[in-house]
């Protein structure tokens, strides 16, 4: 198995996922494409945790670029052995993967909490409330109750869709980073497959 190519593949995947996370999080600030709710602070509290922008986004780009860099041919050597440096790099990628696990984990947790609590919306009495907070997430199964939110229009669908996307993307990122931890440990300890498909023993 070529650990470097695997890492690079994971890296590119993470860049795409991170950008999607950032986009999904940004969309949460503009229900129905309107800016008024963000400016009036009428958004779910979990939107302000920047879970997709920071956790599943920016924090994920660091390990992503580290993983992509592992496949470069001009990887620095150590002790006069080029491959030794590559092994060091693979092991250091484990640290980057752990940062990714923390970021994606944060994204998943916040998205799950956002889904469970439901959106901040104008209820049938004209109050800004977390209308579904007391339902312990049961509102997700009963779409007939979603009309209790009168403004922003389709806010429940908006929040559920985007937090679900963040939850899924964060989950995929978490799994990929976990794979890279295993990949990095195996690549660092058991050797590194170079472009010439050479295998070196530890």
């Amino acid at each position: 198995m070529c650990y470097g190519k695997c890492a690079r593949c994971i890296g590119h995947s993470l860049v795409g996922l991170a950008l999607l996370c950032i986009a999904a999080n940004i969309l949460l600030y503009f229900p129905n494409g309107e800016t008024k709710y963000a400016s009036e602070n009428h958004l779910s509290r979990f939107v302000w945790f920047f879970s997709g922008i920071v956790g599943g986004g920016l924090l994920m780009l660091l390990p992503a670029f580290v993983f992509i860099g592992l496949e470069q041919d001009d990887c620095c050597g150590c002790c006069g052995h080029e491959n030794c440096g590559k092994r060091c790099a693979m092991l250091s990628s484990v640290l980057a993967a752990l940062i990714g696990i923390a970021g994606s984990g944060y994204c998943v947790i916040v998205a799950a909490l956002g889904l469970a609590e439901g959106p901040l919306c104008l209820d049938s009495l004209g109050q800004w409330n977390y209308t579904f907070a007391s339902t312990e997430g049961q509102y997700l199964l009963d779409t007939s109750t979603w009309s209790e939110c009168t403004e922003p229009k389709h806010i429940v669908e908006w929040n559920v869709s985007l937090f679900s996307i963040l939850l899924a993307l964060g989950g995929i990122e978490f799994i990929l980073c976990l794979i890279q931890v295993i990949n990095g440990v195996l690549g660092g300890i058991c050797g590194f497959c170079c472009s010439h498909q050479q295998q070196y023993d530890c």
Epitope: L122, D123, S124, L125, G126, Q127, W128, T150, E151, P152, K153
Partner: antibody, heavy 120, light 106 residues
């Protein structure tokens, strides 16, 4: 000056339709909701429901579903209450009320009221 | 629905006297609003959020309470205070008003 100006008194026969207007001035109409309150002669106040002036979405209290309709003419900063198939028990003064979405939600500006008399 | 019971229905007082009217809910609510209505006029916001005086309301008025029991107090009644006072809750759907307390001056 913030005010809600309501249309004049109405005398109607049972089965007829009445449409009351409530014109807002002195504030941004779409930033506040408009609620409607009924007060029958010698009786207490009864909340009929409200209309979201931003989305146009009407919400009706259980006792006022069916014959009652809230609507808007946003360009004229005006809210309307229409009562169809009038009954004697609809005889009352109807108030339109502005309310704000603050920490303590209350009716901060009231219209003078429109008296509707239903009599055959 | 939450039912608000106001007592007394009619309250007679002499100028300078201290008076208290109460509003009880059949279930716990988070706050209450009070409105003053004089004959032939629309109600005016008087006290909101249980204890906050609306704009232009004299400082002799005060509000207090929590849970199911709320009250409006006038430290020294004046002739202009003669009116009907309604309490209103906004904690539960439907929004409801009390039947009112009519304050008469002797």
């Amino acid at each position: 000056q913030i005010q809600l100006v309501q249309s004049g008194p109405e005398l109607k026969k049972p089965g007829e339709t009445v449409k009351i207007s409530c014109k807002a001035s002195g504030y941004t109409f779409t930033n506040y909701g408009v609620k409607w309150v009924k007060q029958a002669p010698g009786k207490d106040l009864k909340w009929m429901g409200w209309i979201n002036t931003y989305t146009g979405n009407p919400i009706y209290a259980a006792d006022f579903k069916g014959r009652f309709a809230f609507s808007l003419e946003t360009s004229a900063s005006t809210a309307f209450l229409q009562i169809n198939n009038l009954k004697n028990e609809d005889t009352a003064t109807y108030f339109c009320v502005r309310f704000q979405y603050g920490d303590y939600r209350y009716f901060d500006v009231w219209g003078a009221g429109t008296t509707v008399t239903v009599s055959s | 629905q939450i039912i608000l019971s106001q007592s007394p229905a009619i309250l007679s007082a002499s100028p300078g006297e201290k008076v208290t009217m109460t509003c009880r809910a059949n279930s716990g609510i988070s706050f209450i609003n009070w409105y003053q209505q004089k004959p032939g006029s629309s109600p005016k916001p008087w006290i909101y959020g249980t204890a906050n005086l609306a704009s232009g309301v004299p400082a002799r008025f005060g509000g207090s309470g929590s849970g199911t029991s709320y009250s409006l107090t006038i430290s020294r009644v004046e002739a202009e205070d003669a009116a009907t006072y309604y309490c209103q809750q906004w904690s539960s759907n439907p929004l409801t008003f009390g039947a009112g307390t009519k304050l008469e001056l002797r």
